[in-house]
């Protein structure tokens, strides 16, 4: 196949994917904040979105994907499908995905979704900065 296996993409292609993800993530977060005003960020949810074993840090797609699959029915499915499609390209092939359950309580659920979206946006910003701070 012409395409390199998805877990073997060079920094240039990772950067392309991050550039595609940023406006999707930002738009999703802004729309959610407008729709759900007054919802606080949860201090019980931590999205481990960066790998600790690589330099510069890599987006930990396998850790992020289950969260987006979990919140998909409760948010903008169209945008979330696009985010999942991009994250799939960054996923290491044999990395297992854990099951994530969304809080049953409505208010906690909204707080959980907001936290995921905020942490993911911050995470993309961090990875993008690290990709740009190389010898370019």
């Amino acid at each position: 196949s012409h395409m390199a296996p998805t877990h073997q993409l060079p920094p240039s292609d990772v950067r392309k994917i991050i550039l595609e993800l940023q406006p999707l993530s930002r738009g999703l977060l802004e729309d959610y904040q407008k729709k759900e005003t007054g919802v606080p960020e949860s201090n019980r949810t931590l999205l481990l979105c960066l790998t600790s074993d690589s330099q510069p840090p890599r987006l930990n797609s396998s850790a992020i994907l289950p969260y987006f699959r979990a919140i998909r029915p409760l948010s903008d499915k169209n945008i979330i499908d696009k985010i999942i499609e991009q994250l799939d390209k960054l996923k290491f092939q044999h990395e297992p995905e854990t099951e994530i359950s969304v809080p049953a309580d409505t208010f906690e659920c909204k707080s959980f979704i907001l936290t995921i979206l905020q942490q993911f946006s911050a995470c993309l910003e961090s990875v993008f900065k690290s990709l740009n701070s190389g010898p370019q």
Epitope: M3, P5, Q8, P10, P11, S12, D13, I17, G134
Partner: antibody, heavy 118, light 111 residues
């Protein structure tokens, strides 16, 4: 068969703007990445930037303040605009497709020579 | 930016002989066993044509006389045997890191 054809003015005055069109047939610009590259008279090739299937753009930092790549999906065309041109921008300009991650630029236009001169 | 250094700048080879072109990157262009180095051929008055992608993969429709090898920072394009139709300038290009960069080109002539 994928075909790319560049068009635009062959002569631009210093300080002016260069605007080129790349017309694509055989593939849709709403998939893949669509690039501009130029070749200077001494044969040096320079990568300029791209517009993606979703309309995201990214540019070579050496040109960032002067370059804009845009598109018209209804015409299946994408464009290069380079502002504040000097004689140093005299080159043959190519458009090219980057179809798959981890691959290479597999289809190129024939190129169009742009001379910057008063 | 990754600097690509090609050598020689020009090469004169007899028909039927082997031509070898080298390309050196200022830093490694490898990720997980893949080298993001590509080779193009540009004939006079034509656009560049992809010959080899990811260091050693022959692009569809390119004759098997063309071959690519190398990893890390050092790469080689080999044409064996050289034919009259191979008169062109050959360029290496890295897509490992932005901005993508090209070698200065090697002009192949027939002796």
């Amino acid at each position: 068969e994928v075909q790319l054809v560049e068009s635009g003015p062959s002569l631009v005055k210093p300080g002016g703007s260069l605007r080129l069109t790349c017309s694509v047939t055989g593939d849709s610009i709403t998939s893949g990445y669509w690039n501009w590259i130029r070749k200077f008279p001494g044969n040096k090739l320079e990568y300029m930037g791209y517009i993606s299937y979703s309309g995201i753009t990214d540019y070579n930092p050496s040109l960032k303040s002067r370059i804009t790549i845009s598109r018209d999906t209804s015409k299946n065309q994408y464009y290069l605009q380079l502002n504040s041109v000097t004689t140093e921008d005299t080159a043959t300009y190519y458009c090219a497709r980057y179809g798959n991650y981890g691959y290479a630029m597999d289809y190129w236009g024939q190129g169009t020579l742009v001379t910057v001169s008063s | 930016d990754i600097v690509m250094t090609q050598s020689p700048a020009s090469l004169s080879v007899s028909l039927g002989q082997r031509a070898t072109i080298s390309c050196r990157a200022s830093e490694s262009v490898d990720t997980y066993g893949n080298s993001f180095m590509h080779w193009y051929q540009q004939k006079p008055g034509q656009s560049p044509k992809l010959l080899i992608y990811r260091a050693s993969n022959l692009e569809s429709g390119i004759p098997a006389r063309f071959g690519g090898s190398g990893s890390g920072t050092d790469f080689t394009l080999t044409i064996d045997p050289v034919q009259a139709d191979d008169v062109a300038t050959y360029y290496c290009q890295q897509s490992y890191e932005d901005p993508w960069t090209f070698g200065g080109g090697t002009k192949l002539e027939i002796k």
